[in-house]
C-alpha cells in the first residue's frame, strides 16, 4: 500500500521540496507534539464495566520501541453488583498507528513504515443471539 | 532515540540510535488495510456506551482520513435498552503516529506527528458523593 501522491486538485508541488530517490521518501522522526500526553489519571481501565490490563511490548528495531497493548480482563461485563455477567461481552477496541521498522540486511540498514494494530481498551457489547432452528 | 544491536562483524556505526532523518520505502508494510471502523465491527452500535464515528480528513497528513469517536450518550444503555445516567459513557483515547507533509504540500517528505484520537467509548461506574 503506497502513500498517495499529493493530488493536483489540492495544490502544486512547491519548488522547495527536498530531492528524494525514486521509490522512497524522506522521513523526519523528530515527533511533532512529542510532549503531548493522554491523561491516564482517569484510570478508566479499572473502572470500566469491561475492564482491561496493559502490556508493554518492546522492540529495539522499531520506532517507537515501546507499544502498549490492552487486554480485556473478562469475557463478560461487570454488573452493578460487581459480578461478571456472561450474557454480555467485553470486546477490544482497536486503532491503527504507524511505526518505523529498522531492517538489517548484512551490514546495511533500511527503514520501512509499518501499520500496527493497537488494542486501546475494551467496551461492553450486547451479543447478537442466534437460537437453533 | 533507541539503542539497536549491531552486527559485530560490521564496521562501527556513528550512532546506535535511530537517526533523526531516514529514507523510507514508499510501500507501507501492513496486513491491516481496513481503516474504516464502521466496516470492521458494529461494536459502536452494540456497546452499552455506543458512539458515533466522525470523519476527519486532512490531505497534508497520512493517513488522510481518521475516524473520531464521540459518545452518543452521557449515561450507558441498561438491560432494558434505556439510558442509565447513574453510569457514564466516556471516550477511550489513544496517541497515534501519523505522517505530516513537511515542508507542506511536498509529495515525498514527511515528519512523524503524534495525535490524540478518541477510538471508542466505554462505560464506567462513578464514585458517588451524597450531600453531607
Amino acid at each position: 500500500r503506497k502513500i498517495p501522491k499529493v493530488g493536483h486538485t489540492f495544490f502544486q508541488k512547491p519548488e522547495s521540496c527536498p530531492p528524494v530517490p525514486g521509490g522512497s521518501m524522506k522521513l523526519d522522526i523528530g515527533i511533532i507534539n512529542e510532549n503531548q500526553r493522554v491523561s491516564m489519571s482517569r484510570n478508566i481501565e479499572s473502572r470500566s464495566t469491561s475492564p482491561w490490563n496493559y502490556t508493554v511490548t518492546w522492540d529495539p528495531n522499531r520506532y517507537p520501541s515501546e507499544v502498549v497493548q490492552a487486554q480485556c480482563r473478562n469475557l463478560g461485563c461487570i454488573n452493578a453488583q460487581g459480578k461478571e455477567d456472561i450474557s454480555m461481552n467485553s470486546v477490544p477496541i482497536q486503532q491503527e498507528t504507524l511505526v518505523v521498522r529498522r531492517k538489517h540486511q548484512g551490514c546495511s540498514v533500511s527503514f520501512q513504515l509499518e501499520k500496527v494494530l493497537v488494542t486501546v481498551g475494551c467496551t461492553c457489547v450486547t451479543p447478537v443471539i442466534h437460537h437453533v432452528q | 532515540g533507541i539503542t539497536i544491536p549491531r552486527n559485530p562483524g560490521c564496521p562501527n556505526s556513528e550512532d546506535k540510535n535511530f537517526p533523526r532523518t531516514v529514507m523510507v520505502n514508499l510501500n507501507i508494510h501492513n496486513r491491516n488495510t481496513n481503516t474504516n471502523p464502521k466496516r470492521s465491527s458494529d461494536y459502536y452500535n452494540r456497546s452499552t456506551s455506543p458512539w458515533n464515528l466522525h470523519r476527519n480528513e486532512d490531505p497534508e497528513r497520512y493517513p488522510s482520513v481518521i475516524w473520531e469517536a464521540k459518545c452518543r450518550h452521557l449515561g450507558c444503555i441498561n438491560a432494558d435498552g434505556n439510558v442509565d445516567y447513574h453510569m457514564n459513557s466516556v471516550p477511550i483515547q489513544q496517541e497515534i503516529l501519523v505522517l505530516r507533509r513537511e515542508p507542506p504540500h511536498c509529495p515525498n517528505s514527511f515528519r512523524l506527528e503524534k495525535i490524540l484520537v478518541s477510538v471508542g467509548c466505554t462505560c464506567v461506574t462513578p464514585i458517588v458523593h451524597h450531600v453531607a
Epitope: 491523561s39 489519571s41 482517569r42 484510570n43 478508566i44 473502572r47 | 464521540k70 452521557l74 447513574h86 457514564n88 466516556v90 464506567v124 462513578p126 464514585i127 458517588v128 458523593h129
Partner: nanobody, 120 residues
Framework: EVQLVESGGGLVQPGGSLRLSCAAS????????MGWFRQAPGKERDFVAA????????FYADSVKGRFTISRDNAKNAVYLQSNSLKSEDTAVYVC?????????????WGRGTQVTVSS
C-alpha cells in the same frame, strides 16, 4: 470536594415557567457533565436533563423534551434549567448533579435539591 448549590424552585401554576440554577464550586477543573434529576414523593430519582462539558451537547428525558432547555455558563461553572409549559406531574424535588474527573476516578456529586410544585 465539589459543592453544588441549587436555586429557582417554587410554586407555579400549570402552563407556567421556572428557571432553575445550579452553581458548582470546589475542584471543578475537569467537569465531565452537569445536569438535573428529579424525585417525586414515593418515586425513584429520575433523570431530567444534562449537558456534556467537552462539546456542549445536551440530553433530555423524553417526558421533558420540547418543554425544558438546559444551558451552561462555563465561566461560572453553572447550569440552568429553563422549564416551560409545566404540568402537575413535573412536581418534584429537582436535584443538581455534576460528574467530575478526579485524579483516579470519575466522581458524581449531588446537590441538596430545590422543590418545584406545579399546582393551581
Amino acid at each position: 470536594e465539589v459543592q453544588l448549590v441549587e436555586s429557582g424552585g417554587g410554586l407555579v401554576q400549570p402552563g407556567g415557567s421556572l428557571r432553575l440554577s445550579c452553581a458548582a464550586s470546589g475542584r471543578t477543573f475537569s467537569t465531565h457533565a452537569m445536569g438535573w434529576f428529579r424525585q417525586a414523593p414515593g418515586k425513584e430519582r429520575d433523570f431530567v436533563a444534562a449537558i456534556r462539558w467537552s462539546d456542549g451537547s445536551s440530553f433530555y428525558a423524553d417526558s421533558v423534551k420540547g418543554r425544558f432547555t438546559i444551558s451552561r455558563d462555563n465561566a461560572k461553572n453553572a447550569v440552568y434549567l429553563q422549564s416551560n409549559s409545566l404540568k402537575s406531574e413535573d412536581t418534584a424535588v429537582y436535584v443538581c448533579y455534576a460528574d467530575v474527573e478526579g485524579p483516579t476516578a470519575l466522581h458524581k456529586y449531588w446537590g441538596r435539591g430545590t422543590q418545584v410544585t406545579v399546582s393551581s
